[in-house]
Protein backbone atom coordinates (compact mmCIF):
# COMPACT_ATOMS: atom_id res chain seq x y z
CA UNK A 1 0.00 0.00 0.00
CA UNK A 2 1.28 3.48 -0.54
CA UNK A 3 2.45 5.50 2.08
CA UNK A 4 -0.35 7.79 3.70
CA UNK A 5 -0.42 11.42 3.24
CA UNK A 6 2.21 13.49 5.43
CA UNK A 7 4.56 10.22 5.16
CA UNK A 8 6.47 10.49 1.95
CA UNK A 9 9.73 11.08 1.96
CA UNK A 10 9.89 14.59 1.03
CA UNK A 11 8.10 15.40 3.65
CA UNK A 12 10.78 13.97 5.55
CA UNK A 13 13.53 15.21 4.06
CA UNK A 14 11.71 18.79 4.49
CA UNK A 15 11.33 19.60 8.79
CA UNK A 16 11.61 23.76 7.96
CA UNK A 17 8.82 22.93 5.16
CA UNK A 18 5.30 25.29 6.40
CA UNK A 19 2.98 23.11 7.98
CA UNK A 20 -0.04 22.08 5.34
CA UNK A 21 -3.02 23.95 6.00
CA UNK A 22 -6.66 22.56 6.27
CA UNK A 23 -7.65 22.42 2.44
CA UNK A 24 -3.81 21.04 1.47
CA UNK A 25 -4.31 18.21 4.21
CA UNK A 26 -7.71 17.49 2.36
CA UNK A 27 -6.12 17.94 -1.02
CA UNK A 28 -3.48 15.33 -0.13
CA UNK A 29 -5.94 12.82 1.58
CA UNK A 30 -8.13 13.19 -1.45
CA UNK A 31 -5.31 12.43 -3.99
CA UNK A 32 -3.69 9.35 -1.62
CA UNK A 33 -6.82 7.81 -2.01
CA UNK A 34 -7.57 8.56 -5.68
CA UNK A 35 -4.00 7.12 -6.18
CA UNK A 36 -5.87 3.94 -4.26
CA UNK A 37 -8.45 3.61 -6.50
CA UNK A 38 -6.21 3.73 -9.65
CA UNK A 39 -4.29 0.48 -8.46
CA UNK A 40 -7.80 -1.25 -7.24
CA UNK A 41 -8.78 0.09 -10.47
CA UNK A 42 -6.07 -1.61 -12.42
CA UNK A 43 -6.19 -4.91 -10.92
CA UNK A 44 -9.73 -4.92 -11.61
CA UNK A 45 -9.79 -4.19 -15.47
CA UNK A 46 -6.86 -6.39 -15.50
CA UNK A 47 -9.18 -9.08 -14.36
CA UNK A 48 -11.83 -8.66 -16.38
CA UNK A 49 -13.38 -7.25 -19.36
CA UNK A 50 -15.88 -4.52 -17.16
CA UNK A 51 -13.53 -1.33 -18.15
CA UNK A 52 -14.69 -2.10 -21.56
CA UNK A 53 -18.11 -2.21 -21.13
CA UNK A 54 -20.29 0.45 -22.57
CA UNK A 55 -21.93 2.79 -20.14
CA UNK A 56 -24.91 2.35 -21.23
CA UNK A 57 -25.06 -1.49 -20.14
CA UNK A 58 -23.31 0.29 -16.59
CA UNK A 59 -25.56 2.96 -16.19
CA UNK A 60 -28.47 0.04 -16.34
CA UNK A 61 -27.06 -1.26 -13.26
CA UNK A 62 -29.57 -0.30 -10.11
CA UNK A 63 -26.81 0.68 -7.58
CA UNK A 64 -27.63 3.71 -5.90
CA UNK A 65 -23.92 5.46 -5.77
CA UNK A 66 -24.08 8.99 -4.49
CA UNK A 67 -23.53 11.14 -7.24
CA UNK A 68 -23.10 14.97 -7.90
CA UNK A 69 -25.71 17.22 -9.33
CA UNK A 70 -26.17 20.73 -10.14
CA UNK A 71 -28.35 21.08 -6.99
CA UNK A 72 -25.81 20.12 -4.87
CA UNK A 73 -24.58 23.68 -4.97
CA UNK A 74 -20.81 22.16 -5.63
CA UNK A 75 -20.41 23.16 -9.37
CA UNK A 76 -19.23 26.65 -10.48
CA UNK A 77 -23.02 27.80 -11.37
CA UNK A 78 -25.23 27.71 -8.36
CA UNK A 79 -21.96 27.05 -6.03
CA UNK A 80 -22.97 27.01 -2.29
CA UNK A 81 -20.00 26.77 0.15
CA UNK A 82 -21.99 25.26 2.84
CA UNK A 83 -24.59 22.97 0.82
CA UNK A 84 -21.95 21.54 -1.10
CA UNK A 85 -19.89 20.45 1.51
CA UNK A 86 -22.89 18.47 3.67
CA UNK A 87 -23.55 16.62 -0.12
CA UNK A 88 -19.41 15.90 -0.28
CA UNK A 89 -19.70 14.29 3.62
CA UNK A 90 -23.49 12.85 2.87
CA UNK A 91 -21.50 10.99 -0.07
CA UNK A 92 -18.92 9.89 1.23
CA UNK A 93 -20.91 8.29 4.29
CA UNK A 94 -23.34 6.53 1.93
CA UNK A 95 -20.23 5.24 -0.09
CA UNK A 96 -18.76 3.84 3.12
CA UNK A 97 -21.20 0.99 2.74
CA UNK A 98 -19.62 0.11 -1.02
CA UNK A 99 -15.89 0.51 0.12
CA UNK A 100 -17.08 -2.42 3.04
CA UNK A 101 -18.18 -4.75 -0.05
CA UNK A 102 -14.45 -4.08 -1.64
CA UNK A 103 -13.01 -5.16 0.99
CA UNK A 104 -12.77 -9.30 0.16
CA UNK A 105 -12.94 -7.98 -3.78
CA UNK A 106 -9.31 -8.16 -4.13
CA UNK A 107 -6.55 -10.80 -4.34
CA UNK A 108 -2.86 -8.90 -5.11
CA UNK A 109 -4.51 -5.48 -3.60
CA UNK A 110 -6.19 -6.30 -0.28
CA UNK A 111 -4.05 -3.83 1.68
CA UNK A 112 -4.92 -1.06 -0.77
CA UNK A 113 -8.67 -1.74 -0.65
CA UNK A 114 -7.69 -1.23 3.27
CA UNK A 115 -6.23 1.68 2.86
CA UNK A 116 -8.83 3.53 0.53
CA UNK A 117 -11.57 2.82 3.16
CA UNK A 118 -9.40 4.10 6.37
CA UNK A 119 -8.33 7.28 4.14
CA UNK A 120 -12.10 7.65 3.22
CA UNK A 121 -12.75 7.51 7.20
CA UNK A 122 -10.22 10.10 8.03
CA UNK A 123 -11.33 12.55 5.05
CA UNK A 124 -14.94 12.83 6.50
CA UNK A 125 -13.22 13.47 9.77
CA UNK A 126 -10.90 16.54 8.25
CA UNK A 127 -14.06 17.95 6.21
CA UNK A 128 -16.51 17.40 9.41
CA UNK A 129 -14.31 19.72 11.57
CA UNK A 130 -14.82 22.28 8.32
CA UNK A 131 -18.54 22.03 8.22
CA UNK A 132 -20.70 24.80 9.73
CA UNK A 133 -24.12 22.51 10.02
CA UNK A 134 -22.91 19.30 10.66
CA UNK A 135 -26.86 18.53 11.92
CA UNK A 136 -27.67 18.86 8.29
CA UNK A 137 -25.80 16.11 7.66
CA UNK A 138 -27.62 12.34 7.43
CA UNK A 139 -25.78 9.24 8.15
CA UNK A 140 -26.88 5.91 6.53
CA UNK A 141 -28.86 3.65 8.57
CA UNK A 142 -26.80 0.45 9.74
CA UNK A 143 -29.45 -2.07 9.38
CA UNK A 144 -29.97 -0.62 5.72
CA UNK A 145 -26.43 -0.38 5.03
CA UNK A 146 -25.75 -4.38 6.43
CA UNK A 147 -29.00 -5.73 3.89
CA UNK A 148 -27.66 -3.96 1.14
CA UNK A 149 -24.07 -5.67 2.12
CA UNK A 150 -25.69 -9.26 2.15
CA UNK A 151 -27.67 -8.61 -1.31
CA UNK A 152 -24.57 -7.21 -2.83
CA UNK A 153 -22.41 -10.07 -1.46
CA UNK A 154 -25.11 -12.51 -2.99
CA UNK A 155 -24.81 -11.83 -6.57
CA UNK A 156 -23.32 -14.08 -9.09
CA UNK A 157 -19.51 -13.63 -9.75
CA UNK A 158 -20.30 -11.27 -13.53
CA UNK A 159 -22.27 -8.91 -11.33
CA UNK A 160 -20.22 -8.96 -8.07
CA UNK A 161 -17.44 -7.92 -11.18
CA UNK A 162 -19.88 -5.34 -12.36
CA UNK A 163 -20.35 -4.01 -8.97
CA UNK A 164 -16.71 -3.59 -8.11
CA UNK A 165 -16.04 -2.06 -11.35
CA UNK A 166 -19.25 0.43 -10.93
CA UNK A 167 -17.94 1.11 -7.28
CA UNK A 168 -14.80 2.29 -8.32
CA UNK A 169 -15.56 4.20 -11.41
CA UNK A 170 -18.61 6.51 -9.52
CA UNK A 171 -15.82 6.77 -6.47
CA UNK A 172 -13.21 8.14 -8.48
CA UNK A 173 -15.56 10.91 -10.79
CA UNK A 174 -17.33 11.92 -6.78
CA UNK A 175 -13.84 12.51 -5.49
CA UNK A 176 -12.67 14.57 -8.75
CA UNK A 177 -16.32 16.06 -8.27
CA UNK A 178 -15.19 17.36 -4.31
CA UNK A 179 -11.88 18.26 -5.47
CA UNK A 180 -13.01 20.42 -7.94
CA UNK A 181 -15.90 22.00 -5.75
CA UNK A 182 -13.58 22.26 -2.26
CA UNK A 183 -10.13 24.17 -4.20
CA UNK A 184 -13.66 26.74 -4.40
CA UNK A 185 -13.75 26.93 -0.63
CA UNK B 1 -5.63 8.57 -34.91
CA UNK B 2 -5.83 10.42 -31.65
CA UNK B 3 -6.79 13.70 -32.20
CA UNK B 4 -9.04 17.25 -31.57
CA UNK B 5 -9.85 19.37 -34.63
CA UNK B 6 -11.70 22.93 -34.34
CA UNK B 7 -13.86 24.69 -36.65
CA UNK B 8 -16.20 27.21 -36.36
CA UNK B 9 -13.77 30.42 -36.26
CA UNK B 10 -13.86 33.36 -38.41
CA UNK B 11 -14.51 37.12 -38.78
CA UNK B 12 -17.13 38.44 -36.66
CA UNK B 13 -18.37 41.93 -35.33
CA UNK B 14 -18.29 43.00 -32.17
CA UNK B 15 -21.63 42.20 -30.28
CA UNK B 16 -21.92 38.94 -32.50
CA UNK B 17 -21.79 35.74 -31.66
CA UNK B 18 -19.80 32.38 -33.24
CA UNK B 19 -19.71 28.88 -32.13
CA UNK B 20 -16.55 26.62 -31.97
CA UNK B 21 -16.67 23.27 -32.36
CA UNK B 22 -14.09 20.39 -31.38
CA UNK B 23 -14.35 16.71 -32.61
CA UNK B 24 -12.83 14.30 -31.02
CA UNK B 25 -11.43 11.34 -32.35
CA UNK B 26 -9.69 8.10 -30.98
CA UNK B 27 -11.10 8.66 -27.24
CA UNK B 28 -14.50 9.68 -25.86
CA UNK B 29 -15.12 12.39 -24.54
CA UNK B 30 -17.99 11.66 -22.10
CA UNK B 31 -14.93 10.44 -20.19
CA UNK B 32 -12.35 12.84 -20.24
CA UNK B 33 -12.00 16.34 -19.41
CA UNK B 34 -11.81 19.00 -21.81
CA UNK B 35 -10.46 22.83 -22.33
CA UNK B 36 -10.64 26.11 -24.53
CA UNK B 37 -7.39 27.73 -24.29
CA UNK B 38 -6.99 30.97 -26.18
CA UNK B 39 -4.37 32.85 -27.72
CA UNK B 40 -4.14 35.97 -29.16
CA UNK B 41 -2.02 37.87 -31.50
CA UNK B 42 1.30 37.99 -30.30
CA UNK B 43 0.65 36.78 -26.82
CA UNK B 44 0.16 34.24 -24.43
CA UNK B 45 -2.15 31.29 -23.45
CA UNK B 46 -5.55 31.95 -21.87
CA UNK B 47 -7.23 29.86 -20.56
CA UNK B 48 -11.04 30.22 -21.30
CA UNK B 49 -13.20 27.35 -19.64
CA UNK B 50 -13.19 23.27 -19.27
CA UNK B 51 -16.20 20.86 -18.72
CA UNK B 52 -15.81 18.07 -16.38
CA UNK B 53 -17.02 14.86 -18.27
CA UNK B 54 -18.80 13.68 -14.92
CA UNK B 55 -22.38 15.81 -15.03
CA UNK B 56 -21.19 18.15 -17.42
CA UNK B 57 -19.77 20.67 -14.77
CA UNK B 58 -18.19 23.80 -16.39
CA UNK B 59 -15.99 26.27 -15.09
CA UNK B 60 -15.31 29.44 -16.65
CA UNK B 61 -12.95 32.26 -16.77
CA UNK B 62 -13.23 35.58 -15.41
CA UNK B 63 -13.28 37.62 -18.83
CA UNK B 64 -15.55 34.98 -20.53
CA UNK B 65 -17.81 34.69 -17.62
CA UNK B 66 -21.75 34.95 -18.92
CA UNK B 67 -20.83 35.66 -22.70
CA UNK B 68 -19.44 31.86 -23.00
CA UNK B 69 -20.86 28.78 -22.84
CA UNK B 70 -19.11 25.06 -23.17
CA UNK B 71 -21.35 22.39 -23.90
CA UNK B 72 -20.98 18.68 -25.36
CA UNK B 73 -22.52 16.69 -27.35
CA UNK B 74 -21.81 12.79 -26.68
CA UNK B 75 -23.34 11.14 -29.57
CA UNK B 76 -20.97 13.22 -31.80
CA UNK B 77 -17.79 13.05 -29.60
CA UNK B 78 -17.96 17.04 -30.11
CA UNK B 79 -17.55 19.80 -27.57
CA UNK B 80 -18.45 23.40 -28.43
CA UNK B 81 -18.09 26.96 -27.46
CA UNK B 82 -20.94 28.99 -27.99
CA UNK B 83 -19.18 32.58 -27.90
CA UNK B 84 -21.80 35.79 -27.62
CA UNK B 85 -21.77 39.54 -27.29
CA UNK B 86 -17.90 39.13 -28.47
CA UNK B 87 -15.48 42.14 -28.11
CA UNK B 88 -12.03 43.16 -30.05
CA UNK B 89 -10.04 41.33 -26.74
CA UNK B 90 -11.56 37.76 -27.84
CA UNK B 91 -9.80 37.68 -31.00
CA UNK B 92 -7.58 34.85 -30.64
CA UNK B 93 -6.71 31.80 -32.04
CA UNK B 94 -8.65 29.13 -29.88
CA UNK B 95 -7.66 25.99 -28.89
CA UNK B 96 -9.16 22.92 -27.54
CA UNK B 97 -7.42 20.23 -25.69
CA UNK B 98 -7.63 17.58 -22.83
CA UNK B 99 -6.86 17.57 -19.49
CA UNK B 100 -5.33 14.46 -18.70
CA UNK B 101 -6.96 12.21 -16.50
CA UNK B 102 -4.59 12.41 -13.67
CA UNK B 103 -4.83 14.34 -10.32
CA UNK B 104 -4.16 17.46 -10.79
CA UNK B 105 -4.47 17.71 -14.59
CA UNK B 106 -2.56 18.99 -17.24
CA UNK B 107 -3.45 19.23 -20.60
CA UNK B 108 -1.96 16.09 -22.36
CA UNK B 109 -3.71 16.50 -26.28
CA UNK B 110 -4.09 20.29 -27.98
CA UNK B 111 -5.66 20.73 -31.32
CA UNK B 112 -4.31 23.19 -34.18
CA UNK B 113 -6.57 25.92 -33.33
CA UNK B 114 -8.85 28.11 -34.94
CA UNK B 115 -8.85 31.42 -35.85
CA UNK B 116 -11.70 33.91 -33.99
CA UNK B 117 -11.30 37.46 -35.08
CA UNK B 118 -13.52 40.17 -33.85
CA UNK B 119 -13.50 43.51 -35.85
CA UNK B 120 -15.68 45.98 -37.81
CA UNK C 1 -9.04 34.09 -10.98
CA UNK C 2 -5.98 32.40 -10.05
CA UNK C 3 -2.93 34.84 -11.07
CA UNK C 4 0.20 33.26 -12.06
CA UNK C 5 3.10 35.60 -12.34
CA UNK C 6 6.52 33.83 -13.87
CA UNK C 7 9.53 35.83 -14.30
CA UNK C 8 11.61 36.50 -16.30
CA UNK C 9 9.74 37.78 -19.19
CA UNK C 10 12.67 37.30 -21.50
CA UNK C 11 16.04 35.06 -21.15
CA UNK C 12 18.70 35.38 -22.97
CA UNK C 13 21.15 32.63 -23.03
CA UNK C 14 23.80 30.53 -24.81
CA UNK C 15 23.75 26.45 -25.06
CA UNK C 16 25.11 24.42 -22.62
CA UNK C 17 24.16 27.27 -19.79
CA UNK C 18 21.60 26.00 -16.68
CA UNK C 19 17.88 28.47 -16.85
CA UNK C 20 15.90 28.78 -14.39
CA UNK C 21 12.43 29.85 -14.93
CA UNK C 22 9.96 30.57 -11.83
CA UNK C 23 6.74 30.86 -11.47
CA UNK C 24 4.28 32.53 -8.85
CA UNK C 25 0.73 31.88 -7.56
CA UNK C 26 -1.14 34.38 -5.71
CA UNK C 27 -2.68 31.81 -3.55
CA UNK C 28 -1.49 28.17 -2.37
CA UNK C 29 -1.38 25.91 -5.32
CA UNK C 30 -0.28 22.44 -3.46
CA UNK C 31 1.03 21.31 -6.43
CA UNK C 32 -1.10 21.54 -9.30
CA UNK C 33 1.14 23.49 -12.03
CA UNK C 34 2.41 21.95 -15.47
CA UNK C 35 5.06 23.67 -17.60
CA UNK C 36 4.61 23.47 -21.24
CA UNK C 37 7.23 24.55 -24.73
CA UNK C 38 5.32 26.95 -27.46
CA UNK C 39 7.29 26.91 -30.59
CA UNK C 40 6.15 29.59 -33.05
CA UNK C 41 3.14 28.40 -34.85
CA UNK C 42 2.62 25.44 -33.01
CA UNK C 43 0.23 23.86 -30.11
CA UNK C 44 1.88 24.34 -26.41
CA UNK C 45 3.32 20.64 -25.94
CA UNK C 46 3.32 19.62 -21.92
CA UNK C 47 7.17 19.23 -20.10
CA UNK C 48 6.39 18.49 -16.60
CA UNK C 49 3.11 17.77 -14.26
CA UNK C 50 2.10 17.53 -10.78
CA UNK C 51 5.17 20.43 -10.60
CA UNK C 52 7.98 17.72 -10.59
CA UNK C 53 7.06 14.68 -12.67
CA UNK C 54 8.41 14.78 -15.96
CA UNK C 55 6.58 13.71 -19.36
CA UNK C 56 7.27 10.79 -20.99
CA UNK C 57 9.44 11.35 -23.89
CA UNK C 58 10.79 14.91 -22.69
CA UNK C 59 14.54 15.02 -22.02
CA UNK C 60 15.77 14.72 -18.76
CA UNK C 61 17.58 18.00 -18.74
CA UNK C 62 14.26 19.67 -17.90
CA UNK C 63 13.00 19.23 -14.60
CA UNK C 64 10.39 21.53 -11.68
CA UNK C 65 10.11 21.88 -8.59
CA UNK C 66 8.44 23.34 -5.78
CA UNK C 67 5.27 23.75 -3.90
CA UNK C 68 2.31 25.97 -2.69
CA UNK C 69 3.43 29.17 -4.22
CA UNK C 70 6.33 29.16 -5.91
CA UNK C 71 7.43 27.13 -8.56
CA UNK C 72 10.49 26.75 -10.82
CA UNK C 73 11.24 25.02 -14.22
CA UNK C 74 14.76 24.26 -14.76
CA UNK C 75 16.66 23.31 -17.88
CA UNK C 76 20.35 21.72 -17.25
CA UNK C 77 22.36 22.34 -19.96
CA UNK C 78 20.44 24.18 -23.05
CA UNK C 79 20.42 22.78 -26.52
CA UNK C 80 19.44 24.40 -29.60
CA UNK C 81 15.83 22.73 -29.85
CA UNK C 82 14.81 24.47 -26.32
CA UNK C 83 14.80 28.07 -27.32
CA UNK C 84 11.11 28.71 -27.13
CA UNK C 85 8.30 30.51 -25.03
CA UNK C 86 8.04 28.37 -22.17
CA UNK C 87 4.53 28.58 -19.80
CA UNK C 88 3.87 27.57 -16.27
CA UNK C 89 -0.14 26.58 -15.57
CA UNK C 90 -2.08 25.89 -12.38
CA UNK C 91 -5.10 23.09 -12.63
CA UNK C 92 -5.80 23.83 -8.88
CA UNK C 93 -8.82 26.42 -9.67
CA UNK C 94 -9.55 26.54 -13.52
CA UNK C 95 -6.38 26.33 -15.48
CA UNK C 96 -4.89 29.86 -15.46
CA UNK C 97 -1.53 30.25 -17.43
CA UNK C 98 1.75 32.68 -16.46
CA UNK C 99 2.11 35.00 -19.23
CA UNK C 100 4.87 33.44 -20.87
CA UNK C 101 8.92 33.64 -20.63
CA UNK C 102 10.46 33.80 -23.93
CA UNK C 103 14.09 31.96 -24.38
CA UNK C 104 16.42 33.46 -26.77
CA UNK C 105 19.64 32.77 -28.24
CA UNK C 106 22.28 35.35 -26.33
Known amino acids: APVPPGEDSKDVAAPHRQPLTSSERIDKQIRYILDGISALRKETCNKSNMCESSKEALAENNLNLPKMAEKDGCFQSGFNEETCLVKIITGLLEFEVYLEYLQNRFESSEEQARAVQMSTKVLIQFLQKKAKNLDAITTPDPTTNASLLTKLQAQNQWLQDMTTHLILRSFKEFLQSSLRALRQM | EVQLVESGGGLVQPGGSLRLSCAAS????????MIWVRQAPGKGLEWVSD????????YYADSVKGRFTMSRDISKNTVYLQMNSLRAEDTAVYYCARWADDHPPYIDMWGRGTLVTVSS | DIQMTQSPSTLSASVGDRVTITCRAS??????LAWYQQKPGKAPKVLIYKASTLESGVPSRFSGSGSGTEFTLTISSLQPDDFATYYC????????FGQGTKLEIK
Open chain 3, 27 to 32: QGISSW
Open chain 2, 51 to 58: LYYYAGDT
Open chain 3, 89 to 96: QQSWLGGS
Open chain 2, 26 to 33: GFTISSNY
